[in-house]
């Protein structure tokens, strides 16, 4: 168990031309919170796919009016951190979601209005314990800073907060395996669940399930005295009688640094020498470019060759967002009827439909075509009675002269009213209620509700929102 | 071709309840649109009186005309109407039926009926 | 109640004209950008021009456009035609599920 934090240092307008216009006024204040989304691994889920590791909302910031005919400062920023708690073991690797919402407090009747102003999405490597991680992402023509980390809560311990401490038996000393638990060395690490048979003299786990030898024992289960023959290595005590020891595991072993960074041994653990433009414990974080990976979904990464210019991710076709971070998953709305099997192609949607029905949504059972013609495209289908046609894609009804109904599988959730646009379907949420679907409530879990409603998120690309 | 057609009486009574008919042709309530009513006073602006979702007929009206206006669907007959309680001279009006089908406009309008109210 | 103020209320333009109506909302619009500019001309319905506030509908001459988010949006033509003389209406829905529309701006030809 463990807490992740997020401490966001500044947002306001980014460098370069086409600085935005300050989101408050004299005669509409408003104030910034923040929204964070976590996901374990790096998540290739929708935008909108449950925030698996845990989400958080920030306090409301400061009041802020713009000062008439001055730029778009930095804002006004909520104090404190978001702290987004975890119950099992940190996963290492994560995706990030980071929203900024508008509060505005005129005179609206039912209490404040909320807009999103930017959404900015990541996937990052980070080992809890370690130092924060400082983190620069543009939204549009917004850039934010911010810096985040991992913590593990007591008793657990460990770059997955997968270890426990516990008080020392002892006055002096530690168990064989364990060390002292940094930074409470009056405590030691509780040993693991190891490998069953794991030597508890000579053998220890840092990972349930697991047997790893000390200095001068091998095999499976550490039972195995180290063969001393031709002495070579340069770890463990040696002579002619008795040979060499194997090495044990080395913190290095296996390069922790990522990006290039080299590794250099420390008394306690180890140390990234990072290359230009990467910083963190091993070397995980660079400001937002290319070299960081910021496209999901096998997207292609344009620009952003250093830290000060932006990047544009250009999806696959079934991705969109600024991040590629959002499946277009369109068969969650289950469109295919009477009983047929969805096929989400990326470039087109495909129902494969059980015998006896036909049409772009298997919406139609096989009947004679009479004669009669079919609507924007469809083609008439023969059967065993009156006509059917089977409609081009986005049409239906008995001469595909309706449009098919992509609201039917009643995809806005909370109450929301979804309407079935030419464009696809839009939500528009109930008051206290956001999000694409409307699935996010505005106020933090166990709050009261809110009086009055945020917008909706659209479903398209999140810049389009900036 | 998808249309609005607006019908009613042309001359209501004051004190009298207006009933209009909007009668659609070319799509379905199936799918899921605002259906609303706008009313223009002579030589004034448009406003907008109320809308029904036909999600779940949900409906809500401007803050003036709730408890006078009701807006209902016969979706057998592919229409909805629009009562106006207690008409006073300051309800004649152009009355339109309007379809909105996401992002917040209405992309289609019927052609409009004029209504007056008069003894 | 949401109010929605166009000005101005009216104006004279020549042909070729860069002509600019303004549209302020008492109450952010839902989703920063659902709202909408309509031209109507004596005895016709309302025909939509833009929706979501810079959208340009189909159909609709290129020198219409629109921008803004929030509470405050503006309507351009850039080079007005005869054609144009009308009265234009903005038009915006709001949280709640509530629309409102504003008080319209005649656009005349000098």
């Known amino acids: 168990a463990g807490v992740f934090e997020l401490q966001i240092h500044s947002f306001g307008p980014g460098p370069g031309p086409g600085a935005p216009r300050s989101p408050c006024s004299a005669r509409l204040p408003c104030r910034l919170f923040f929204r964070v989304c976590l996901k374990p691994g790096l998540s290739e889920e929708a935008a909108e796919s449950p925030c698996a590791l845990g989400a958080a909302l920030s306090a409301r910031g400061p009041v802020y009016t713009e000062q008439p005919g001055a730029p778009a400062p930095d804002l006004p920023l909520p104090d404190g951190l978001l702290q987004v708690p975890f119950r099992d073991a940190w996963p290492g690797t994560f995706s990030f979601i980071i929203e900024t919402w508008r509060e505005e407090l005129g005179d609206q009747i039912g209490g404040p209005a909320w807009s999103l102003l930017a959404r900015v999405a990541g996937r990052r490597r980070l080992a809890a314990g370690g130092p924060w991680a400082r983190d620069i992402q543009r939204a549009g023509a917004w850039e934010l800073r911010f810096s985040y980390r991992a913590r593990c809560e007591p008793p657990a311990v460990g770059t997955a907060c997968t270890r426990l401490c516990r008080p020392r038996s002892a006055p002096s000393r530690c168990g064989p395996g364990l060390r002292p638990c940094a930074p409470l060395e009056d405590e030691c690490e509780a040993p693991l669940v190891c490998r069953a048979g794991c030597s508890p003299e000579h053998g220890f786990c840092e990972q349930p399930g697991e047997c790893r030898c000390l200095e001068g024992w091998t095999g499976p289960l550490c039972t195995v005295p180290v063969s001393t023959s031709s002495c070579l290595s340069p770890r463990g005590p040696s002579s002619a009688t008795t040979g060499c020891l194997v090495p044990g595991p080395g913190p290095c072993d296996g390069n922790p640094c990522a990006n290039g960074g080299s590794c250099s041994e420390t008394p306690r653990s180890f140390e990234c020498t990072c290359p230009r433009g990467f910083y963190g414990l091993r070397c995980e974080v660079s400001g937002v470019t290319c070299a960081d990976g910021p496209c999901f979904n096998g997207g292609l990464c344009v620009g952003g060759a250093d830290p000060d210019s932006a990047y544009i991710c250009h999806c696959p076709p079934g991705f969109q967002g600024s991040n590629c971070e959002k499946r277009v998953d369109r068969c969650s709305l289950q469109p295919c009827r009477n009983g047929g099997l969805c096929l989400d192609l990326g470039h087109a949607l495909r129902c494969r439909c059980r015998a006896g029905f036909a049409g772009p949504r298997c919406e139609h059972d096989l009947d004679d075509c009479a004669g009669r013609a079919c609507a924007n495209g469809g083609t008439c289908v023969e059967g065993g009675g009156a006509h059917r046609c089977s409609c081009a894609l986005g049409f239906g009804g008995r001469d595909c002269r309706e449009r098919a109904d992509p609201c039917a599988a009643r995809p806005c959730a909370h109450g929301g009213r979804c309407y079935a646009h030419f464009s696809g379907l839009v939500c528009a949420c109930a008051p206290g209620y956001m999000g694409a679907r409307c699935e996010f409530p505005v106020h933090p879990d166990g709050a009261s509700a809110l009086p009055a409603a945020p917008p909706g998120l659209r479903p398209g690309d999140p810049q389009r929102y900036l | 071709q998808v249309t609005l057609r607006e019908s009613g009486p042309a001359l209501v009574k004051p004190t009298q309840t207006l009933t209009l008919t909007c009668t659609f042709s070319?799509?379905?309530?199936?799918?899921?649109?605002?259906m609303g009513w706008v009313r223009q006073a002579p030589g004034q602006g448009l406003e907008w009186m109320g809308t029904?979702?036909?999600?779940?007929?949900?409906?809500d009206y401007a803050s003036w005309a709730k408890g006078r206006v009701t807006i209902s669907v016969d979706r057998s007959k592919n229409q909805f109407s629009l009562k106006l309680s207690s008409v006073t001279a300051a309800d004649t009006a152009v009355y339109y039926c309007?379809?909105?089908?996401?992002?917040?406009?209405?992309?289609?309008w019927g052609q409009g009926t004029l209504v007056t109210v008069s003894s | 109640d949401i109010q929605l103020t166009q000005s101005p209320s009216f104006l004279s333009a020549s042909v070729g004209d860069r002509v600019t109506i303004t549209c302020q909302s008492t109450?952010?619009?839902?989703?920063?950008?659902?709202l909408s500019w309509y031209q109507q001309k004596p005895g016709q319905p309302p025909k939509l021009l833009i929706y979501q506030a810079s959208n340009l509908e189909i159909g609709v001459p290129s020198r219409f456009s629109g921008s803004g988010s929030g509470t405050d949006f503006t309507l351009t033509i850039n080079s007005l035609e005869a054609e144009d003389a009308a009265t234009y209406y903005c038009q915006g829905y709001y949280s709640g599920y509530i629309y409102a529309f504003g008080g319209g701006t005649k656009v005349e030809i000098k």
């Open positions: 309007a379809r909105h089908t996401g992002y917040g406009y209405f992309g289609l």
């Open positions: 070319g799509f379905s309530l199936s799918s899921s649109y605002d």
């Open positions: 109450e952010s619009v839902y989703g920063s950008d659902w």
């Open positions: 029904i979702y036909t999600g779940d007929y949900s409906t």
